[in-house]
């Protein structure tokens, strides 16, 4: 539970943080999980111990493994494991999956890309920003902070960016990179008022008597996630539960589908043991959303039975 | 129509509409209002059947429709009555596949006047 995956490139700085928190007060020891031997707490060292970070400067394919680190107080001691892997820098564009930090969305109205894990370094202002490897030019393109904005965020924005930074420790300087995949959502969503697709207005549906039958009532509502949206049967002009036919019976539950994009519901009317009472009502499929409310209905005929050749 | 009438600011009255000549269910109805120069709005609307509703915007919270299947009458209940809510307020209705504000509505009250003073 108290285990952090921290990845890195040799010859880049490297620094982790104890997934045991504490208060700042409070000392924190390092370990080589393997040997169980302590890791200096001096600058001097390229890897060393400073408070809840361990920092690898620079890293080297060598130190992979896992690392122990003990939040020690007055009262009790919290051990955490850091399990650290050092890759070999690539000699192609390409960033492997196992290299890649969170993949984040934007939008249109929201394009905020953090650089991750930079609050762990001493780093100075500018970012420089990469996209496939090329660097970002052009006005659409900011670096603010420790984040890069993207004016009018389009489709194709899409991919991994990385973000280099120079980490400064005691006047020496270490160079960091890292990426983390960028997809676009599409919030042109849009609500209209419903539209039915089954049944059509005023279908007569052949059932056989005796036989079970079901009707679909389905609707549509519009692009993306839709907010008071609803599909549902009437018999007569009242709802299932108050008619009191018992063979006559709203599926639970509402089948929500993706249609080309559009957001569509459907319930199905489960009628059992059809009698001929049942050809004299009106059922009436229902959509409603926030725009209104629309109504298709439906009449049942008899299934002439299929004549048998002797 | 019927429950219109003079309200000051704050105020409450209810507005019923009873239907003759046709089965109360799978209607949609509504009320409307129309204050003087302005254009006809639709301020509630209703789905007798299964009690759907639908508000304006500047009616949510105050102002509740009703159905009394029984006695086949519509209502609403206004409350927080505010000058601006003063018009002349129809009942409609419509048979037709559609529900809601707006809609066209086939059948339509003479009206009763609402005037709210502050």
């Known amino acids: 539970k108290f285990s952090k995956q921290s990845w890195g490139l040799e010859n880049e700085a490297l620094i982790v943080r104890c997934p045991r928190q504490g208060k700042p007060s409070y000392t924190v020891d390092w370990y080589y999980s393997q040997t169980n031997k302590s890791i200096p707490t001096q600058e001097r060292n390229r890897v060393f111990a400073s408070g809840q970070l361990l920092k690898f400067l620079p890293a080297a394919v060598a130190d992979s493994g896992i690392y122990t680190c003990i939040v020690r107080s007055p009262t009790f001691n919290r051990t955490g494991y850091a399990n650290v892997t050092i890759y070999k820098k690539q000699s192609d564009c390409n960033v492997p999956d196992y290299l890649m930090y969170s993949t984040v969305s934007g939008s249109e109205k929201n394009s905020k890309i953090y650089c991750p894990t930079i609050d762990l370094y001493n780093w100075t202002a500018p970012l420089e920003w990469f996209k496939n490897c090329q660097a970002l030019q052009g006005s659409r393109y900011r670096a603010h902070k420790s984040f890069l904005v993207i004016d009018n965020v389009m489709t194709e924005d899409a991919g991994d960016y990385t973000c280099k930074f120079i980490h400064n420790e005691n006047g020496a300087n270490y160079s960091v990179t890292a990426t983390r995949s960028f997809t676009v959502k599409d919030e042109q969503g849009f609500s209209l008022f419903p539209v039915i697709g089954a049944p059509a207005q005023n279908e007569i549906k052949e059932v056989e008597i005796g036989k079970n039958a079901n009707l679909t009532c389905s609707a549509c509502f519009g692009k993306g996630t839709q907010f008071l949206a609803a599909v549902l049967w009437q018999l007569n002009g009242t709802k299932i539960t108050d008619f009191g036919e018992p063979r006559i019976q709203q599926e639970e539950g509402q089948n929500q589908s993706f249609s080309n994009g559009l957001a569509c519901l459907d319930m199905v009317l489960r009628i059992a043991d059809v009698k001929e009472e049942d050809l004299l009502l009106q059922y009436d499929c229902l959509a409603l959303n926030l725009h209104g409310l629309r109504r298709h209905t439906v009449r049942l005929s008899r299934k002439n039975p299929s004549k048998e050749c002797f | 129509e019927s429950g219109g009438g003079s309200v000051q600011s704050g105020g409450s009255l209810r507005l019923s509409c009873a239907a003759s000549?046709?089965?109360?269910?799978?209607?949609?109805m509504g009320w409307f209002r129309q204050a003087p120069g302005k254009e006809r709005e639709g301020v509630a609307v209703?789905?007798?059947?299964?009690?759907?509703?639908y508000y304006a915007d500047s009616v949510k919270g105050r102002f509740t429709i009703s159905q009394d299947n029984a006695k086949k009458t519509l209502y609403l209940q206004m409350n927080s009555l505010k000058p601006e809510d003063t018009a002349l307020y129809y009942c409609?209705?419509?048979?037709?596949?559609?529900?809601?504000?707006?809609?066209?509505?086939?059948?339509w009250g003479q009206g009763t006047q609402v005037t709210v003073s502050s």
């Open positions: 000549g046709y089965t109360f269910r799978r209607y949609c």
């Open positions: 209703l789905y007798t059947g299964v009690d759907i509703t």
């Open positions: 409609a209705a419509d048979s037709g596949p559609l529900c809601g504000l707006g809609i066209q509505f086939g059948y």
